[in-house]
Structures are given as structure tokens and as C-alpha cells.
Interface confidence: low
């Protein structure tokens, strides 16, 4: 059962796994949630009645029964991990802690104008986990305005002490705010020969890379495949680091693969969710339970529903045995990974899907694209919404994209003459406009946030957010699209689609069925040549065929230019403007979303 509230002056007795230091009980709960085994925790707040060396301790706990006896203790705050909950979880922590010094290895010291600048520096430094900033009121003159970047083995402070006139905080890498490059390449036949900080067992290089990504100290990894000559090292995933942040030495070796942590792009790719099945593979670990199951999919469901289960092995039934049910072995380990991986025994193994909620919902695979044709099918573009105005009569106004459970991203120019959000209705999961009747459910709009530098579509900043009055429950027909990663600025997208109910030619009408068109991106240089009277800025992105014929048009405005990259759909552009529709050598111009990621996150994550 999901318990979110914190229990004040309460301590859980026993079940200790480990003790870390956190600046708040709230963050202690997050650390517990991300720990492979933690189900409960007890945090000690600062208090005159408590020994200062115990202040800010966060004791992570586990229990077979999923609960522990409660004891009354002043300054203790206890609670449960969010593993038991179904809601989305994020490690993003933007809080700034005043008069707290978070201890770690101070590996970089520099002058900064503000705590915010110090936090940005930490976010854009590959090694930085957290920082402490001495304000200009700090007593010691030579330490004023000093920004200390820190890291530790665990990613959490080794101690936290009270210190006047300093502030501390965490890197915002997990908030998708880092400008560090997102390097997705996996290099075959390659060993990175740098120092190992940890090693785990993994069934393939992709799982190894994901484990590296959420390990606080891992910057890159080497994985030895099951064909690796040295038997004792098969399926071994080595988590690595180096002073420079890059591999210093690499060796060519067959049957080894290496790659980088995906920390800088983790909001737009699955990191915790290992959804594949591994055939003829047995995962070894501590056995939690053995249950009968009809299939390996059913076994995975059982593991996902058992809060302590981390991975499983399913052995199919022998012919006509046990009503055709096989054995489902639910397992766990100290680090969430199998202790050993064996091949050739006929088992089918996999991981719990419970951790998938720690990934951004937008990374979930959607149904395959329908190739050919121009009309979409239901569920093909689940982030696409139709924005209606009810004044003077109800009609489709613009497209938009779901980017969060309360947020729609669209174009600013859609709101010319819109006096109030009250006249707006957002319909999601719609394929045909004719589905929209008086009793069709919709989302009311609480707030329209237009970029404050917007003047007109052609001069840029054509971007707006709609905050919905109620939250969207994600389903197959309505779910978010990922924002592009700032670390992905160099990516060349080759599979891009524009969608909408807009006109099919300049003098036309709104279409009933959601239309789609695959459109190639055009370089800004090329686009500028086609629009000599306009300035095509880096905050715009263009797409279209040289010969014309396919394009967005009136009524598509605000809708998505969606591009598929590494099996994940990204909102690369927002339909903005163009000269006519689908004209020869007149590409469509879209708002370049990657350039507005900071603005979007600032507005949507505002407290």
C-alpha cells in the first residue's frame, strides 16, 4: 500500500540497511525510493534534544513484512519509500538549504556570483553531486562567494553540519537541466581500462548502461558479453570513472562493449526500466518466493506486484504438468542485480517493471507507426491534443502536445485575441473531430503562459504552455511526448512527422481525421535562403520537401513536429509559420523546442 505522508516524532525500530546523510526528510524519502532494497526510513532532524552528530541522518530500512514497529522519538521523522506507490517519481531536487554545509570531496573551488550560478556549475560538471556556496555575508573574507563542487561515492553527503551564511544544494542533472553531452554510442569490441568503482551482473550492454546511468559515480562502463573468453567475467558490468570524466585508455577486445552514462539524457530515455525478457537465461539471487505462472509475462507481473521482487526467472512447465503452469522464481539481491547469470538451462528471466515509474512516462513505447497514408489511427500520436475555443462558437483552434500530466505545449500565436483561459477546452485521445460532442470530457485551462519575448510568430519565441485545471491520467491514447535533451543538440533527426487537423491546402477547412505527414528537417542555412525577408534564428527549426507537397497548414499551428530517435519520440518542433502551405522551396518553420527546454522546465517545475 502507498503511504506518502511522513510520521513526525516517530522512529522505525530495526531493519537497518545503511545510513546516509540528507538535508531533509523529504529527500531521505527520495533516497530510500531509489535504493534497491529500502522500503522504510527514519530521518533525524536538527533538534536541541538530539546529539548533533545524529542530525540529518537518514537510516534506510527493509522489512519482509513491509513495515516495522514504531517507537516515539522527538526529532525523528519516518516514512515509506515511494516504491509502493504507482505515481511518477523523480530524483530532481531543486531545494536550496540555508546554513547547511553538505560534506563531500571538495574537488573544485571557484568564485560564483550567486548560489544559482554555483548550482548551474555543479549541474554542468560531470563529477558534481552537490555543492556548498559561501554567501557574501560569510565571516571569512577569503571564502566569500566561493562555490565548492563536491562528490561522494554514494552521491549523498558524508556528513551535514550547521554553518552560518552558507547554502547547499544538489546538481540538477536529474531535472534534465544539464548541458553536458548526451553520448548514446555503445562501442563494440572495446574495453575502457579506467578504474572500476563497482561491478554488477547484467544480461546485456543496454542494462549495464542503464545501471551506470543511475549509479552516482559511474561515468562510463565496460560490459563483458556471454561469449567473453574468461568464464568468470561473463555478463560482468564494470562501472567506471576517471579524473577527466572520459576514458583515458581503451583496449580493442572482442566480445566486450563499452559506453557512457546517459545521465545527461535520462529524462528522455528509459534508465530504470529493463523491460526485455532474456531467453535461456537464469538470474541467480536471494529467493523471495516460488509461484506457479502461465507464462514469463505473467511471472514478470507477479514480480512487479511484489514490492521486494527485483528480478525473476521463469521455468516453463514440462508437458501437461501443473495445468500447463511453469515455476516463477521471484528474487532479490543487495544491489538489485542478479548475483550470477547462467545460460543454457532453459529459464526465461527479466526484471520488475515497478521501477519504470522512475523513468519519464514519455519514454514508454507506443504502438508501431502506420506506414503510408495520411490519416492517422487511434493511439498513433497519443500526445497530440486538439485545443478548442468556445467563443463565439466552439471550434478547433490549434494543436498542442501533452508534455506532463498538467501541461500542454503549443504555439503563442494561437492565443491572439483570446482574452481568458476560460474559453479554452483541451481534448486528448481524439482521432476524429466528429467525436467531440457536448458531453465529451475535456480539460479546462487554468493558465496560459506565453513566452514574454513573443511578439509575432515570424520573429520567434512562438511558444506557450497551458496549465490544465485537472491532471491527465495516462493511457494508450493520451500520454506525454519527451522533450529533446539539451545534451542532444547535435542529433540529426531523420524520422520526423507533423500532425494535425489543419487545412490540406491553403483554401480548405479543418479536417475531421488527424492527418500525418513525414517531413525531412532542413538546415537553418538552407531555410534562410528560402526566407530572405525573415531572420531564421537558431531558436527555429525548418522542415519540408524541396518540391513542396507535404507541410503543416492553417489549423495545425501549435501541434507537434515529432521525431523518433533511439525508439523514443521527441517533441522537436512546434508548428509555427511558413509562406503558404506545402509550397515549393518554402519549408515550414517550427519553434525549436530544445532551445526552450530551460524555459519549459522553469515554468512547469515552479513551486
Amino acid at each position: 500500500e502507498c503511504v506518502t505522508q511522513l510520521l513526525k516524532d516517530t522512529c522505525f525500530e530495526g531493519g537497518d540497511i545503511t545510513t546516509v546523510f540528507t538535508p531533509s526528510a523529504k529527500y531521505c524519502q527520495v533516497v530510500c525510493t531509489y535504493h534497491p532494497r529500502c522500503l522504510l526510513f527514519t530521518f533525524t532532524a536538527e533538534s536541541p534534544s538530539e546529539d548533533p552528530t545524529r542530525w540529518f541522518t537518514c537510516v534506510l530500512k527493509d522489512s519482509v513484512t513491509e513495515t516495522l514497529p514504531r517507537v516515539n522519538r522527538t526529532a525523528a521523522i519516518s516514512g515509506y519509500s515511494f516504491k509502493q506507490c504507482s505515481h511518477q517519481i523523480s530524483a530532481c531536487n531543486k531545494d536550496i538549504y540555508v546554513d547547511l554545509d553538505m560534506k563531500g570531496i571538495n574537488y573544485n573551488s571557484s568564485v560564483a556570483k550567486s548560489a544559482q550560478e554555483c548550482q548551474e556549475r555543479c549541474t554542468d560538471d560531470v563529477h558534481c553531486h552537490f555543492f556548498t556556496y559561501a554567501t557574501r555575508q560569510f565571516p571569512s573574507l577569503e571564502h566569500r562567494n566561493i562555490c565548492l563542487l563536491k562528490h561522494t561515492q554514494t552521491g549523498t553527503p558524508t556528513r551535514i553540519t550547521k554553518l552560518d551564511k552558507v547554502v547547499s544544494g544538489f546538481s540538477l542533472k536529474s531535472c534534465a537541466l544539464s548541458n553536458l553531452a548526451c553520448i548514446r554510442d555503445i562501442f563494440p569490441n572495446t574495453v575502457f581500462a579506467d578504474s572500476n568503482i563497482d561491478s554488477v551482473m547484467a544480461p546485456d550492454a543496454f542494462v549495464c548502461g542503464r545501471i551506470c546511468t543511475h549509479h552516482p559515480g559511474c561515468l562510463f562502463f565496460t560490459f563483458f558479453s556471454q561469449e567473453w573468453p574468461k568464464e568468470s567475467q561473463r555478463n560482468l558490468c564494470l562501472l567506471k570513472t576517471s579524473e577527466s570524466g572520459l576514458p583515458s585508455t581503451r583496449i580493442k577486445k572482442s566480445k566486450a562493449l563499452s559506453g557512457f552514462s546517459l545521465q545527461s539524457c535520462r529524462h528522455s530515455i528509459p534508465v530504470f526500466c529493463h523491460s526485455s525478457f532474456y531467453h535461456d537465461t537464469d538470474f541467480l539471487g536471494e529467493e523471495l518466493d516460488i509461484v506457479a505462472a502461465k507464462s514469463h509475462e505473467a511471472c514478470q507481473k507477479l514480480c512487479t506486484n511484489a514490492v521486494r521482487c527485483q528480478f525473476f526467472t521463469y521455468t516453463p512447465a514440462q508437458a501437461s504438468c501443473n495445468e500447463g503452469k511453469g515455476k516463477c522464481y521471484l528474487k532479490l539481491s543487495s544491489n538489485g542485480s542478479p548475483t550470477k547469470i547462467l545460460h543454457g538451462r532453459g529459464g526465461i528471466s527479466g526484471y520488475t517493471l515497478r521501477l519504470c515509474k522512475m523513468d519519464n512516462e514519455c519514454t514508454t513505447k507506443i504502438k508501431p507507426r502506420i506506414v503510408g497514408g495520411t490519416a492517422s489511427v487511434r493511439g498513433e500520436w497519443p500526445w497530440q491534443v486538439t485545443l478548442h475555443t468556445t467563443s463565439p462558437t466552439q471550434r478547433h483552434l490549434c494543436g498542442g502536445s501533452i508534455i506532463g500530466n498538467q501541461w500542454i505545449l503549443t504555439a503563442a500565436h494561437c492565443f491572439y485575441g483570446v482574452e481568458s483561459p476560460k474559453i479554452l477546452r483541451v481534448y486528448s485521445g481524439i482521432l476524429n473531430q466528429s467525436e467531440i460532442k457536448e458531453d465529451t470530457s475535456f480539460f479546462g485551462v487554468q493558465e496560459i503562459i506565453i513566452h514574454d519575448q513573443y511578439k509575432m510568430a515570424e520573429s520567434g519565441y512562438d511558444i506557450a504552455l497551458l496549465k490544465l485545471e485537472t491532471t491527465v491520467n495516462y493511457t494508450d491514447s493520451q500520454r506525454p511526448i519527451c522533450l529533446p535533451s539539451k545534451g542532444d543538440r547535435n542529433v540529426i533527426y531523420t524520422d520526423c512527422w507533423v500532425t494535425g487537423w489543419g487545412y490540406r491546402k491553403l483554401r480548405d477547412k479543418i479536417q475531421n481525421t488527424l492527418q500525418k505527414a513525414k517531413i525531412p528537417l532542413v538546415t537553418n542555412e538552407e531555410c534562410q535562403k528560402r526566407y530572405r525577408g525573415h531572420k531564421i534564428t537558431h531558436k527555429m527549426i525548418c522542415a519540408g520537401y524541396r518540391e513542396g507537397g507535404k507541410d503543416a497548414c492553417k489549423g495545425d499551428s501549435g501541434g507537434p513536429l515529432s521525431c523518433k530517435h533511439n525508439e523514443v519520440w521527441h517533441l522537436v518542433g512546434i508548428t509555427s509559420w511558413g509562406e503558404g502551405c506545402a509550397q515549393r522551396e518554402r519549408p515550414g518553420v517550427y519553434t525549436n523546442v530544445v532551445e526552450y527546454v530551460d524555459w519549459i522546465l522553469e515554468k512547469t517545475q515552479a513551486v
Epitope: A181, C182, I183, R184, D185, F187, P188, N189, T190, L246, S248, T249, R250, I251, K252, F260, N490, V491, I492
Partner: antibody, heavy 122, light 107 residues
Framework: QVQLQESGPGLVKPSETLSLTCAVS?????????WGWIRQPPGKGLEWIGS???????YYNPSLKSRVTISVDTSKNQFSLKLSSVTAADTAVYYC???????????????WGQGTLVTVSS | DIQMTQSPSSLSASVGDRVTITCQAS??????LNWYQQKPGKAPKLLIY???NLETGVPSRFSGSGSGTDFTFTISSLQPEDIATYYC?????????FGGGTKVEIK
Amino acid sequence: QVQLQESGPGLVKPSETLSLTCAVSGYSISSGYFWGWIRQPPGKGLEWIGSILHSGVTYYNPSLKSRVTISVDTSKNQFSLKLSSVTAADTAVYYCARDRTTVSLIEYFQHWGQGTLVTVSS
Amino acid sequence: DIQMTQSPSSLSASVGDRVTITCQASQDISNYLNWYQQKPGKAPKLLIYDASNLETGVPSRFSGSGSGTDFTFTISSLQPEDIATYYCQQFHLLPITFGGGTKVEIK
């Protein structure tokens, strides 16, 4: 067909920084591969300076590491070399080159620029 | 760093002769070795990769062999256009290193 073209000053004063750019045509740097710099002092052999991946990952020769910076500008489809505190020993023909395979690390230099001679002299 | 020792440093042969150049690595580099040809005033050109594979478009008179530390490059029948300096290059470990080169001339 991939073409690489080095450009930059042919004469650099001692202790200054040598700066060269390699313009790539016929292929988008962003699409992958390692892009490298190799030099050859007059009448001598080849020396690898360093290489860069489109995403910004760099590898440098340890003998030059403290003085070398290689960077990539995907918007201009070019990559650059900066070598600081130069001496007469840095006089060489500087070549830019592209690796042969996209999936592996630096292996075979398949495509080369024609080279540019940089002389270090006061 | 891995040292690559090429020998001879220069040789002179007649048209039609079989020419052999050797390259020795200071440690085992498996087959991670390439051979290049450099004509005067030109950039090097990749001839052989992975010790023995002929690059596309390179005449079949050029060949390579070897593994571990000892490698051989052969021109089965020397042609006038083969006048050049030949270099071996290892890519087993960074930094990438080249041999000192072998200058081939026609008698």
C-alpha cells in the same frame, strides 16, 4: 564523397597558439565517426595528435595532452585543433582525417585532408 | 605507449620485384594494425586494415599478414607508381602510434 580541408595560418610565433580548422563536406559530422588530427614534421614520420567524436568525446595523445584542445562545431560541419605554447618542434604538416568505421573507436584513418604546413618561427 | 619498429627504413628494388616490409610492435596488438602509403607531397592513403584486409579500390598486389607483435607488408610485383613511403599503425591501445616509415625506391 567525403572531403576534408584544413585551414589556418601557415606561420605561428613561438609560445603562441596554433589554430587550425578542418571543414568537412559530403558528410555530416553529427552522423558519427571519429575525426582526428595527425601531424608530420618535415622529413619525419606521422604522429597522432587526437580525435573527437561528433558528441564531443575527445581522445588526445598523452605527449601533447596538456597543450591540445580539439573541438567540434556541428552547425558549421567542422572541427578544430588548438595547440598552445608552440615551439619550433611543432613545425609540421598538419592533417585532419576521418575514421573508417562509425561503430568503433579510432582505428583506421580512411579519409584525409591534403595537409597544411605550419611553421613555428619568430 | 606502444612502439612500432619498421624495417628497413628504406629499400631500392626493380620493377616487378617482390618487396617485403616488416613492422614489430613493442607488445601484443592482436591484429589491430593498418598499413598506409604516402606519396611525396600527398596525404597518407589507407591500404590494409586489420593486418590483412585490403581496403576497397587498392590493387591486389598489396597484402599484409601477421598477428601479435610481428607483421609483414608485401608488394608482390613492384610497379613504378608504388614509389612512396609506407607506414604501419597500431590501434590496439591509445595513443595510436605509427612506425617510422619505409621509403621504397626503384633501382
